[in-house]
Interface confidence: medium
């Protein structure tokens, strides 16, 4: 989808400093769909428009992130900005619908983990939870510590993926199971892409 993320970023960059602050405050109290978590207050208040966009997309994925941004903007009385996002939502929805084919008619090869390597590196944020699920059963103590030692989520995921070539299918399934529990909406989003 991509363009949804860009549209969220455009909207947030159009906000004044006070408006962005107000947006964050409303984001802390807005009604969320069942199953979605709230971005922690401490981290949220420190974010600039770019960081906030990334967080919105990683927490809520592009489609719902866009919808949530529209809701908050409308609540702030910024109808024009919200309408611009609505246009993006409709356009990207049409593109997604046109591109979608039934999963069963597509003979996909390779495991989910291999298919979506880049997206997982870019979008998995709760890496430590994933590592804990794999510790002992899939990752050795040394591998676990090596991944933990990396500073950013992306570097941690890159390090984790450096071990994947030696894994068998059940190891990959263990990673996928951890992702399904920790990032269920990301998995659903990627599975449909």
């Amino acid at each position: 989808m991509g363009r949804a993320r860009d549209a969220i970023l455009d909207a947030l960059e159009n906000l004044s400093g006070d408006e962005l602050k107000k947006f964050k405050m409303k984001l802390l109290t807005v009604q969320l769909r069942e199953g979605y978590g709230r971005i922690p207050r401490g981290a949220l208040l420190q974010m600039d428009a770019i960081d906030l966009t990334d967080k919105l997309v990683s927490y809520y994925l592009e489609s719902y992130g866009l919808e949530l941004t529209m809701t908050v903007l409308r609540d702030m009385g910024l109808q024009e900005l919200a309408e611009q996002l609505q246009t993006t939502k409709e356009e990207s929805g049409a593109v997604a619908a046109a591109a979608s084919v039934p999963a069963q008619s597509t003979a996909r090869t390779g495991h989910f983990v291999d298919q979506h390597r880049q997206a997982l590196i870019a979008r998995v944020t709760e890496v430590d939870g994933v590592l804990d699920a794999l510790h002992g059963s899939v990752l050795t103590e040394g591998q676990y510590q090596a991944v933990r030692a990396e500073t950013t989520s992306q570097d941690k995921m890159r390090k984790l993926f450096s071990f994947v070539p030696s894994w068998n299918l059940t190891c990959k399934d263990s990673l996928l199971q951890a992702l399904k529990e920790i990032h269920p909406y990301l998995v659903m989003d990627l599975e449909q892409s």
Epitope: G35, N168, L169, M188
Partner: antibody, heavy 122, light 107 residues
Framework: QVQLQQSDAELVKPGASVKISCKIS????????IHWMNQRPEQGLEWIGY????????MYNEKFRGKATLTADKSSSTAYMQLNSLTSEDSAVYFC???????????????WGQGTLVTVSA | DIQMNQSPSSLSASLGDTITITCHAS??????LSWYQRKPGNIPKLLIY???NLHTGVPSRFSGSGSGTGFTLTISSLQPEDIATYYC?????????FGGGTKLEIK
């Protein structure tokens, strides 16, 4: 088309072992996991585990670890399940099944063997 | 292990009726749920996967819905060939688990 052909019914004595086969045709054997389920009389379905012929790895339901051993023979495109130390509790119909697609752990079973009835009786 | 509770365990309905079978998961399984039909003496047949996707060749009178812990299978305009036992199955985590089944009979 995809077919899973299971071995015939077995009547075995308590304490003995049995090995059930599931011969695959209609697709590349090493591309897909083969899962095993059972159904006891008047009971629901239970998942036993899977074997991935591509690398030989297997995943088991802990309840069946030690009871069932899953293997695969690439040369004959056949998956096997050996059941050990059989008791009357193991009397059931055993199914092999293949998922809709191999892409991930979304195990929706679109293709099934016809079932093998195992009866454990003295 | 995730427990899958199906209700009712048996159901009697008339031809042409719309019936609903429910499946409750003991924890959140998102949309990772499928439904199977098993007729007496036959093998299980996949009807619906990922909560609401109709499998190829399955009549459109079958539909599925739900996410999280609550799911339903609906059969509209019941036909004689729908007499069977229906099972739900979760694909969220290992071990994969099935519901106890709902036996559907015609009045």
């Amino acid at each position: 088309q995809v077919q899973l052909q299971q071995s015939d019914a077995e009547l075995v004595k308590p304490g003995a072992s049995v090995k059930i086969s599931c011969k695959i045709s209609g697709y590349t054997f090493t591309d897909q996991t083969i899962h095993w389920m059972n159904q006891r009389p008047e009971q629901g379905l239970e998942w036993i585990g899977y074997i991935y012929p591509g690398d030989g790895s297997a995943m088991y339901n802990e309840k069946f670890r030690g009871k069932a051993t899953l293997t695969a023979d690439k040369s004959s495109s056949t998956a096997y399940m050996q059941l050990n130390s059989l008791t009357s509790e193991d009397s059931a119909v055993y199914f092999c099944a293949r998922p809709l697609y191999s892409y991930a752990s979304y195990y929706w079973f679109a293709y099934w063997g016809q079932g093998t009835l195992v009866t454990v009786s003295a | 292990d995730i427990q899958m509770n199906q209700s009712p365990s048996s159901l009697s309905a008339s031809l042409g009726d719309t019936i609903t079978i429910t499946c409750h998961a003991s924890q959140n399984i998102n949309v990772w749920l499928s439904w199977y039909q098993r007729k007496p003496g036959n093998i299980p047949k996949l009807l619906i996967y990922k909560s609401s996707n109709l499998h190829t060749g399955v009549p459109s009178r079958f539909s599925g819905s739900g996410s999280g812990t609550g799911f339903t299978l609906t059969i509209s305009s019941l036909q004689p060939e729908d007499i069977a036992t229906y099972y739900c199955q979760q694909g969220q985590s290992y071990p994969l688990t099935f519901g106890g089944g709902t036996k559907l009979e015609i009045k």
